[in-house]
């Protein structure tokens, strides 16, 4: 190798000066007594290099780029070497931002998975590699107070969201949960999450059934519908609310929404619908009064009102 | 401090009738699920029934339906189960227990003998 | 109906031994495993919640791992007062069910 560069620094914030230095060893002055040493950014030359020979008899040029204003590229120094350049070595130059401070972070706990899914988002682009880590600790008070480190949760590549398994999480017991992000720039940390992951808790919803017509229930009055629901055997022990949303199959009406249900109503008398039209149906829950986050709506369930009873006049018969 | 005392078990004939109470304190009663568990004189632990916060939701085990019915009063705190056709088999210590969000049981009474015999 | 399975039903150890019960769902049951004690002539006690969480004023030494249908409980080191006999139990549907136990002896 007949040439080196080095840099000040080859990661900057986007827009900054770079000042770089290529030096030419003496054993390699046969090519030109006096060689002269050019720059090229990407496929750009470069002009403003200083030149000096040192005391060795080493050749030095020294650049500085006032802005360097390419997310990446490739810095090379360079002889002439007849009609074409010979690099003599290159170095890679990033730019870019540090990590702004995730914002937004949320978290739910999902019973099915047993695990507390937390996501967030990451700010701005950075073009640079930039690396996120959920990080948490328990608690036993408001998160003052710092208890047992948990196991960082790293997600995987260019996500923003990641799961705590169940055997690093203690229900009933506050958490502190933040969001750490990295980069050859800085560091920043979201605020932190104080929270009990049953506080989070999505449940998953009930599943809605039509109510089998017994021979002593009187039939649904006509803009009525009857249906029942079956709850997540799972979340059973957990209080809840709920509440149903219908539209007409038909036509581009939005959905109406009733409630709130008690979870343990399990049947239902929907009235004041359109009769002889059908409707799609759904329901969500939430633990409540404790807090949780709604289920999402429930597979939808589809019912038609019955035709509206025909209307009886009556003569007299005069004898 | 949250506390259940059980009341109500005795020598009672087969096919005769029983009613257990159990009485809460320490906790709001009407926010929680509640059950009976038994335990047969030398043996494990067999779920009964449980009931839902308001009373609604009242599953019971294949061998005490239709014989067993469990009711609560969450203006009394007090739990009940009233056991009807009793057999020498439901013979047990029944115990009454709060019911946590997840299904297990915490904490339990002190628990009432059943005896059932002739 | 989930069917649930406990061993050993007995188990004979000596005060400072690791201690380790199983238990297995007939059936996926997630995490709705709890893990009592009992002592002759007393109420059961709720050690574990939850397949893995510890109840409040429960010591350290026990523990509780798995999900699906393999479960354990572990004693650390066998205290005095460990000697009982222990039940698993699932809540993930009705009905309910408990396993038969393990009775822990002194050796």
């Known amino acids: 190798e007949c040439g080196h560069i080095s840099v000040s620094a080859p990661i900057v914030h986007l827009g900054d000066p770079i000042t770089a230095s290529c030096i030419i060893k003496q054993n390699c002055s046969h090519l030109d007594p006096e060689p002269q040493i050019l720059w090229r950014l990407g496929a750009e030359l470069q002009p403003g290099g200083r030149q000096q020979r040192l005391s060795d008899g080493t050749q030095e040029s020294i650049i500085t780029l006032p802005h360097l204003n390419h997310t990446q590229a490739f810095l090379s120094c360079a002889l002439n070497w007849g009609n074409s350049l010979q690099i003599l070595d290159q170095v890679e130059l990033r730019a870019g931002y540090p990590p702004a401070i995730p914002h937004n972070l949320s978290c739910l706990m999902n019973l099915t998975t047993s695990s507390l899914i937390c996501q967030w988002e990451p700010g701005p682009e950075t073009h640079l590699p930039t690396s996120f880590t959920l990080k948490s600790f328990k608690s036993r008070g408001n998160c003052q107070t710092q208890g047992d480190s948990i196991l960082d949760c790293v997600p995987k590549d260019g996500q923003s969201h990641c799961s705590i398994p169940r055997k690093h999480l203690l229900l009933y017991q506050n958490m502190g949960i933040w969001v750490q992000a990295e980069n050859a720039l800085g560091t920043s940390m979201s605020p932190q999450l104080c929270l009990d992951p049953m506080d989070v808790v999505k449940l998953e919803p009930p599943m809605l059934r039509t109510m089998d017509p017994s021979p002593e229930a009187a039939p649904p009055q006509a803009g009525c519908l009857q249906l029942s629901w079956e709850p997540w055997q799972p979340g059973l022990h957990i209080n809840q609310k709920c509440e149903l949303r219908h539209k007409p199959q038909r036509g581009e009406a939005s959905w109406a929404l009733v409630g709130p249900l008690p979870l343990e109503a399990l049947q239902y008398e929907l009235c004041g619908l359109l009769p002889a039209t059908a409707y799609t149906l759904q329901i969500r829950c939430i633990r409540w009064p404790l807090p949780g986050h709604w289920s999402d709506w429930s597979p939808s369930l589809e019912l038609r009102t019955t035709e509206r009873a025909p209307t009886h006049h009556h003569h007299h018969h005069h004898h | 401090e949250v506390q259940l005392l059980e009341s109500g078990g005795g020598l009672v004939q087969p096919g005769g009738s029983l009613r257990l109470s159990c009485a809460a304190s320490g906790f709001t009663f009407s926010l929680y699920w509640m059950g009976w568990v038994r335990q047969a004189p030398g043996k494990g632990l067999e779920w009964v029934s449980s009931?839902?916060?308001?009373?609604?939701?009242?599953p019971y085990a294949d061998s005490v339906k239709g014989r067993f019915t469990i009711s609560r009063d969450n203006s009394k705190n007090t739990l009940y189960l009233q056991m009807n056709s009793l057999r020498a088999e439901d013979t047990a210590v029944y115990y009454c227990a709060k019911l946590g969000e997840l299904g297990w049981f915490d904490p339990w009474g002190q628990g009432t003998l059943v005896t059932v015999s002739s | 109906d989930i069917q649930m399975t406990q061993s050993p039903s007995s188990l004979s150890a000596s005060v400072g031994d690791r201690v380790t019960i199983t238990c297995r769902a007939s059936q996926g049951i997630s995490s709705y495993l709890n893990w009592y004690q009992q002592k002759p002539g007393k109420a059961p006690k709720l050690l574990i919640y939850y397949a893995s969480n510890l109840q409040n004023g429960v010591p350290s030494r026990f523990s509780g791992s798995g999900s699906g249908t393999d479960f354990t409980l572990t004693i650390s080191s066998l205290q005095p007062e460990d000697f009982a006999t222990y039940y698993c139990?699932?809540?993930?549907?009705?009905?309910?069910?408990f396993g038969g136990g393990t009775k822990v002896e002194i050796k």
């Open positions: 139990q699932q809540s993930y549907m009705y009905p309910i069910k």
């Open positions: 009931i839902s916060s308001s009373g609604g939701v009242t």
